[in-house]
């Protein structure tokens, strides 16, 4: 429970709680923005990204966005909170503990997105379809 | 009975510095992940920086990089917070909290996780 000392205060997403009055430790996740990356056509790839942040709020999850076009890669790492879409879609995997990308339907690129809640679970994005959700042992992990 | 307590708080003038100690006690502390966290007159926790149990690994909020730096003694069982260019929305009531590596919630027990805090307070 929170302490009778330390305040809650009303209306204050900094304070996550459940129903018992626990606090939510935040998320430490990779966050770098957007980088160019060197990441293709590989199983699985690390983020490169040397930067590691405590998540602003405690109900955000770790992100990691890889896009290819015409002309670069880029891999974009940050944390976000999984009830709010992001780059308009919903973030559905972020109960698990692993990043497994999936592809998402954007004009003039290719673009795959992942989720996760484990500490810096963004630093190593997973592409195998062995790792795909459909796997009935992934998904005891991530409902465990 | 686990322990957690806060010291090193006091009045300071912005941009000066202070460092903030946590004792611990009644749990073993090299297995722990250790947090500072921060909450300031009528606002929520801001959760200020953590630092692993073993290699010191640390990680700060954007709000305090490069001003603040985390350590601790596992010899000691003491956690530290060494605040630097101290300014007036660093004013808050300081805590240290304990987190098992992994682990996503605090348990229920108040003792199990929080000190009294200490107070800080920026004003020239």
């Known amino acids: 429970t929170i302490p009778p000392h330390v305040q809650k205060s009303v209306n204050n997403d900094m304070i996550v709680t459940d129903n018992n009055g626990a606090v939510k430790f935040p998320q430490l996740c990779k966050f770098c923005d957007v980088r160019f990356s060197t990441c293709d056509n590989q199983k699985s790839c690390m983020s490169n990204c040397s930067i590691t942040s405590i998540c602003e709020k405690p109900q955000e999850v770790c992100v990691a966005v890889w896009r290819k076009n015409d002309e670069n890669i880029t891999l974009e790492t940050v944390c976000h909170d999984p009830k709010l879409p992001y780059h308009d879609f919903i973030l559905e995997d972020a109960a698990s503990p692993k990043c497994i990308m999936k592809e998402k339907k954007k004009p003039g690129e290719t673009f795959f997105m992942c989720s996760c809640s484990s500490d810096e679970c963004n630093d190593n994005i997973i592409f195998s379809e062995e790792y795909n959700t459909s796997n009935p042992d992934l998904l005891l992990v991530i409902f465990q | 009975e686990v322990q957690l307590l806060e010291s090193g708080g006091g009045l300071v003038q912005p941009g000066g510095s202070l460092r903030l100690s946590c004792a611990a006690s009644?749990?073993?502390?090299?297995?722990?992940r250790m947090w500072w966290v921060r909450q300031a007159p009528g606002k929520g926790l801001e959760w200020v920086s953590?630092?692993?149990?073993?290699?010191?690994?640390?990680y700060y909020a954007d709000s305090v990089k490069g001003r603040f730096t985390i350590s601790r003694d596992n010899s000691k069982n003491t956690l530290y917070l060494q605040m630097n260019s101290l300014r007036a929305e660093d004013t808050a009531v300081y805590y240290c909290?304990?987190?098992?590596?992994?682990?996503?919630?605090?348990?229920?027990?108040?003792?199990?996780?929080w000190g009294q805090g200490t107070l800080v307070t920026v004003s020239s």
């Open positions: 009644g749990f073993t502390f090299t297995e722990y």
């Open positions: 953590a630092i692993e149990p073993i290699g010191n690994r640390t």
């Open positions: 909290a304990k987190q098992m590596p992994g682990q996503k919630w605090m348990a229920k027990s108040r003792f199990d996780y």
